[in-house]
Amino acid sequence: AVNGTSQFTCFYNSRANISCVWSQDGALQDTSCQVHAWPDRRRWNQTCELLPVSQASWACNLILGAPDSQKLTTVDIVTLRVLCREGVRWRVMAIQDFKPFENLRLMAPISLQVVHVETHRCNISWEISQASHYFERHLEFEARTLSPGHTWEEAPLLTLKQKQEWICLETLTPDTQYEFQVRVKPLQGEFTTWSPWSQPLAFRTKPAALGKDT
């Protein structure tokens, strides 16, 4: 198992959560493993139990405090260890000196709502969740709209290169059902990645007025 392809990837949500995924080819599904967090300048330690998410993959969340509390800064280093039970003892399988603000993945945007809808246009707003005040305005967004007869993967990506928590969708078809999603990413961090997509927001454009050219 040790010589198989292993992966240990963790992301900080910028506030009080480090989420980790551990995968190892050849590892037994019922292997008991955990992630231990040991900060270099904090008094707390934290542990979470890795739970199976697929055949050879486990995940867990290190909850560092209240969801909106700022538990780590850009100068913190958190040593993360994967420990797996071997008989009566725990064996260290992986170690990483984790820099939280180099490995960011924010929570998905929330509170999506239609601000205004017309026949060809729709204005949508959203909010970011549990995002650090350190970012100020240094965030970007991607959005996509699901049209009838298409898949999310086919939807073109709309990029907002600034902290703009709204969008005006144009050239829509009247009286048509759409869905909309958005995700967010800080500009900071070597291994920073996009948040998960938001929950889809369903909306319908207004029908064209009868006898009018709109």
Epitope: S6, F8, D40, I95, Q96, D97
Partner: nanobody
């Protein structure tokens, strides 16, 4: 492009000591891990030791545990391997390697986890 250059190899008698150094240049990663591997004539390349970015974690092959010590100096972008109580079976070309993702440990001793490699330095231990 990251370059790794090893130095400090040479000929030493069994029971003696050597310190290998690895200097990195041409780029930096926020939290990389560095390691030493070795390859003896006619054998596969094998893991020797690894160290995390801040030096808070180390990992050693069973064959060198207690004899070799890996350290790093991030200010000088160097990694050192202090080798004591050397044995003839330690004879090999020693390679420095870098893993940008920064993870080490028994599950990460495979050379495929390391992206950047040095050219190697020869260590010969005579009996």
């Amino acid at each position: 492009q990251v370059q790794l250059v090893e130095s400090g190899g040479g000929l030493v008698q069994a029971g003696g000591s050597l310190t290998l150094s690895c200097a990195a240049s041409g780029g930096a990663f926020s939290s990389d891990a560095k390691a030493w591997f070795r390859q003896a004539p006619g054998k596969e390349r094998e893991f020797v030791a690894a160290i995390t970015w801040a030096g808070r974690g180390t990992d050693y092959a069973d064959s060198v545990k207690g004899r070799f010590t890996i350290t790093r100096d991030n200010a000088k972008a160097t990694v050192h391997l202090q080798m004591n109580s050397l044995k003839p079976e330690d004879t090999a070309v020693y390679y420095c390697a870098l893993n940008p993702r920064g993870v080490i440990g028994p599950a990460f001793r495979n050379s495929n986890h390391y992206t950047y490699w040095g050219q190697g330095t020869q260590v010969t231990v005579s009996s």
